[in-house]
């Protein structure tokens, strides 16, 4: 399987909410012994390998934000902790998973990474990630709502294994 990022850049005004999205592509094994660990974290632009550095999102680590479930099942993060930080990650039946960030500030700008790990018989078998950038703007140059820029098809599907 692969991970696609429908949008490579999100440009939002301060105070807005945004939902960053990744999509699981390709054949997904739905066997009862296969589960998917999905999560989000921040990283630096300057890494030799994109998303190799795992930094927290609003002080929540990738472990705090993870979803753990089988195949294309729907799931949500533990509400209390994430919502106190204005965050919610979710996954639907169609392979889409997302993180919603509320009340954006300039400090939320940066590179965001989604990570999917396929786990068989309790062992990590396959892991892939996707990257996208969030730019929060303020002042007269800021858009009134979030503006999203699609990834090129090559970018969105040519995701390196972590």
């Amino acid at each position: 399987f692969k991970v696609a990022t429908p949008y490579s850049l999100y440009v939002c005004p301060e105070g807005q909410n945004v939902t960053l999205t990744c999509r699981l592509l390709g054949p997904v094994d739905k066997g009862h012994d296969v589960t998917f660990y999905k999560t989000w974290y921040r990283s630096s632009r300057g890494e030799v390998q994109t998303c190799s550095e795992r930094r927290p999102i609003r002080n929540l680590t990738f472990q705090d934000l993870h979803l753990h479930h089988g195949g294309h099942q729907a799931a949500n993060t533990s509400h209390d902790l994430a919502q106190r930080h204005g965050l919610e990650s979710a996954s639907d039946h169609h392979g889409n998973f997302s993180i919603t960030m509320r009340n954006l500030t300039l400090l939320d700008s940066g590179l965001y990474c989604c990570l999917v790990v396929e786990i068989r018989h309790h062992h990590s078998e396959h892991r892939v990630h996707g990257a996208m950038e969030l730019q929060v703007q303020t002042g007269k140059d800021a858009p009134s709502n979030c503006v999203v820029y699609p990834s090129s098809s090559q970018d969105s599907e040519n995701i390196t294994a972590a």
């Epitope: 921040r42 630096s44 300057g46 002080n59 930080h85 400090l107 730019q135």
Partner: antibody, heavy 120, light 111 residues
Amino acid sequence: QVQLVQSGAEVKKPGASVKVSCKASGYNIKDTYMHWVRQAPGQGLEWMGRIDPTHGYVIYDPKFQGRVTMTRDTSTSTVYMELSSLRSEDTAVYYCARDRFDPYWFLDVWGQGTLVTVSS
Amino acid sequence: DIVMTQTPLSLSVTPGQPASISCRASESVEYYGTSLMQWYLQKPGQSPQLLIYDAFNVESGVPDRFSGSGSGTDFTLKISRVEAEDVGVYYCQQSRKVPWTFGQGTKLEIK
């Protein structure tokens, strides 16, 4: 190693504009933001704004909004700060400074500074 | 704007003795548990250099006699044993809100 080298000192008349350059080496300029900070003679540090060299997005201190313009040329790894309608109070050393993300931002490398003197 | 107030504004210390500088922000500089407070040293005739970031993280290459503490609005920079090379002006700076703002500076001299 990471280095920021700024253009030389300038003397300008009131009402004129000045454009200061900052050339980065030792890293990819698109990897992080660049900030401009100034320091009037014998005074403290004053943040002016920042530019994202990847997209060109800028954020200015409202105090300078309308007078300052930050631009970049990624092909030469150079950022620029232009200040217009100069007045004597703009006499200062102007620094460019790179920021680093971990997991927020701070200024970890500074240029050597460019003295801009505004005098009639 | 967030106003940063440093105390004292000047400090004269005997080599080997400790030194402490305080910085108070006019409002909290916390963001979801991280204190967005930095400390810089500007040695005479030089550009500022980073000492401490996020209130207590010591920058690589900075001697371990420097330490930072505090949260919310009140922060402290400590030098456990002052050395001659520590002379200069120390600035605190917040990056919680734009515009980023600096304290007025604290001048450290050696007795």
